[in-house]
Every structure is written in C-alpha cells, then in structure tokens.
C-alpha cells in the first residue's frame, strides 16, 4: 500500500528534476520507526514518509563508525588540533565518507606549549 | 576501486559441503557490507546474506539460515561462503559483492557450483 | 519480506527508442531501491542507487525515479548495448530481495 507523501513543490509548473538528494530517514519519535525524510531537487523540496527499522538502529547505534588516528600537535596559529578518522562501518543505508577530519580546541596547556615553541622559532 | 576475486568452479556431489572464497584487493576490504548472491541456471537473482568483515557481523536471508556460513579473513581480506548438505537446487552461479551506500558495489566474478550425483 | 514486481516481463525495442522500466513495492521502501543491468554469462552491473542517485561510469542515458512505493528506470535512447535484463533491489529491509527481472530485447 503506497504511503501518502508531503509534497511541498517549490519549483514552477511541469518542472522536472533529473536528480533528487535524500537526507536521513528521522522517526517522529524515539530512534526508530516511522518518520520523514526529507529531499531537495534544485529550487523543489519533497518531504516523504519512511520507517527506520528498529532492529537496524539496535544493531548499528551511529549511522557511520571511524577509527581514528591519535591527535595531531596543536596549531599555534588557529588554537586547535587536527586527527582523521576513515570508516570503520557504516549503517547499510548510510552514505558515509570514507575518511574525515575532525578538530578541537587546544587545552590551554598544550596552547601555551605552541605558542612557547612558536617564539623560540622566531629568536 | 575494489576488485573481487572468486574461486573456481566447483561440482559436488549432493551433501558434500563447498566453500566459495571471495579475495578483495584495492580499497579497504574491512569497512564495506560483504553480500553474497545466487542465481540458478536460467533465474533471476537471490540475496543469501551479507557480513560485515570490521566485526563478523553477519545478516542472513532466513531462508539459508541452516544452508549458508559466511566468514572472513581479515588478514588476507579474502570471504568466504560455505553451503552445507547441498542438495541439486542449489545448483546456481553464487557471486560477492561489496557495498558502499556512497559509492555503490563492485561483484565478484562469480562461481558456478553444480551439484549432482 | 519485501515482494518487488518487475513490468513488462519483456521489452522489445528498437535502437535509438525510449525504454521505461517499472518497479512496484509490495510496502514503502522510501528510495532505498537499485537498478542492475545482467548480460548473459557476467555479474550484475550497478546503474542507479537510491532511486534516482547516478552511479560513476554509468552513461547519463540511464535515470530512475522513485521513492516510495512506485519507481521506473528510464533509458532515454536505447544503444544497442543496452541489450540486457534489468533487475530491482530494494534494501530497505531484510531480507534483502530482487524483482523478478525485464528483459530488454532487439524488436
């Protein structure tokens, strides 16, 4: 039985798209179940009902899971340091990237170290 | 780029068990769903089950529940597909694939196995 | 599980016509629905993911659409090349199944 679909068409009359890109599946309630996924298509937008399975969200937690590397040294400059992760496993359905990189704020104790490295580079 | 690799083609005699190999080489073999697939002479195509070689995970179609065992070798990035007691029916070409929801799957060569007395 | 029915069973067409192929969903399966092209004697080919998602390598000439309970894969100029069965699979939930193939064939 079709479900019935939300259609909020933005685009002018007859308008056609060649290719639709579709977000996650987010339940209504709780972490599973039913719920909507939204789409976009060049000016139009669709919102459709979808259903994560609540078996997936069990076996799987996080849609994309990485391995990460150790934290890279902290960067004087910006106050942040830099690891990379590549992809462990993904949820079946997940359109994971491969590697990504992610950073955070020095603690102030390793800035300081930056920055007193930083100036002994430049006596 | 993942290429997969099957082994040859194998004849069995009605429960003899066969194990199908699947060597993967390029990208990383470990972060992708591993499935496996059939497709008897003349048929369309059946999904048996998959596994994830990160963690052994493995999601079998019901129906092979006590036909088919799927494993891996990690360390020789190479799956495997074990059929027990295999009976004439189970007569089909079985095939691998890796799957990545981003980029799509790559499949195996695929390897007739025959079963006959 | 999940019944995927394939229409027409058999495609007969000329070089240069447009092919539509239909696949119909037993439930709604959002877009998590795949397009394979099998020639004889090779594994499937992949042509479109998720419905209407292009797939590298694959000519611009194939599209789907979808998603919900209705899709349709459009060959919008038929190269002989494209002389094949074309197969649906939905992966939405398990197990995961295949429809039950088209062929397209030379008129």
């Known amino acids: 039985v079709a479900k019935k679909k939300d259609k909020v068409k933005k685009g002018g009359p007859g308008s056609e798209c060649a290719e639709w890109a579709w977000g996650p599946c987010t339940p209504s309630s709780k972490d599973c179940g039913v719920g909507f996924r939204e789409g976009t298509c060049g000016a139009q937008t669709q919102r459709i009902r979808c259903r994560v399975p609540c078996n997936w969200k069990k076996e799987f937690g996080a849609d994309c899971k990485y391995k990460f590397e150790n934290w890279g040294a902290c960067d004087g400059g910006t106050g942040t340091k830099v690891r990379q992760g590549t992809l462990k496993k993904a949820r079946y359905n997940a359109q994971c990237q491969e590697t990504i990189r992610v950073t955070k704020p020095c603690t102030p104790k390793t800035k300081a170290k930056a920055k007193a490295k930083k100036g002994k580079g430049k006596d | 780029q993942v290429q997969l690799v099957q082994s040859g083609a194998e004849v069995k005699k009605p429960g003899h068990s066969v194990k199908v190999s699947c060597k993967a080489s390029g990208q990383s073999f470990s972060s992708y769903w591993m499935n496996w697939v059939r497709q008897a002479p003349g048929q369309g195509l059946e999904w048996i089950g998959m596994?994830?070689?990160?963690?052994?995970?493995?999601i079998l179609n019901q129906k092979f529940k006590d036909k088919a065992t799927l494993t891996v070798d990690i360390s020789t990035s190479t799956a495997y597909m074990e059929l027990s007691s295999p009976r004439s029916e189970d007569t089909a070409v079985y095939y691998c694939?890796?799957?990545?929801?981003?980029?799509?799957?790559?499949w195996g060569q695929g390897t007739l196995v025959t079963v006959s007395s | 599980e999940i019944v995927l029915t394939q229409s027409p069973a058999t495609l007969s067409l000329s070089p240069g016509e447009r092919a539509n192929l239909s696949c119909r969903a037993s439930?709604?399966?959002?877009?998590?629905l795949h397009w394979y092209q099998q020639k004889p004697h090779q594994a499937p080919r992949l042509l479109i993911k998720y419905a209407s998602q292009s797939i590298s390598g694959i000519p611009a000439r194939f599209s789907g659409s979808g998603p919900g309970t209705d899709f349709n894969l459009t060959i919008s100029s038929v190269e002989p090349e494209d002389f094949a069965v074309y197969y649906c699979?939905?992966?939405?939930?398990?197990?995961?199944?295949f429809g039950g193939g088209t062929k397209l064939e030379i008129k």
């Open positions: 694939s890796s799957w990545s929801a981003k980029r799509g799957d790559f």
């Open positions: 699979q939905q992966s939405n939930s398990w197990p995961l199944t």
């Open positions: 439930e709604s399966i959002s877009n998590n």
């Open positions: 596994i994830h070689p990160s963690d052994s995970e493995t």
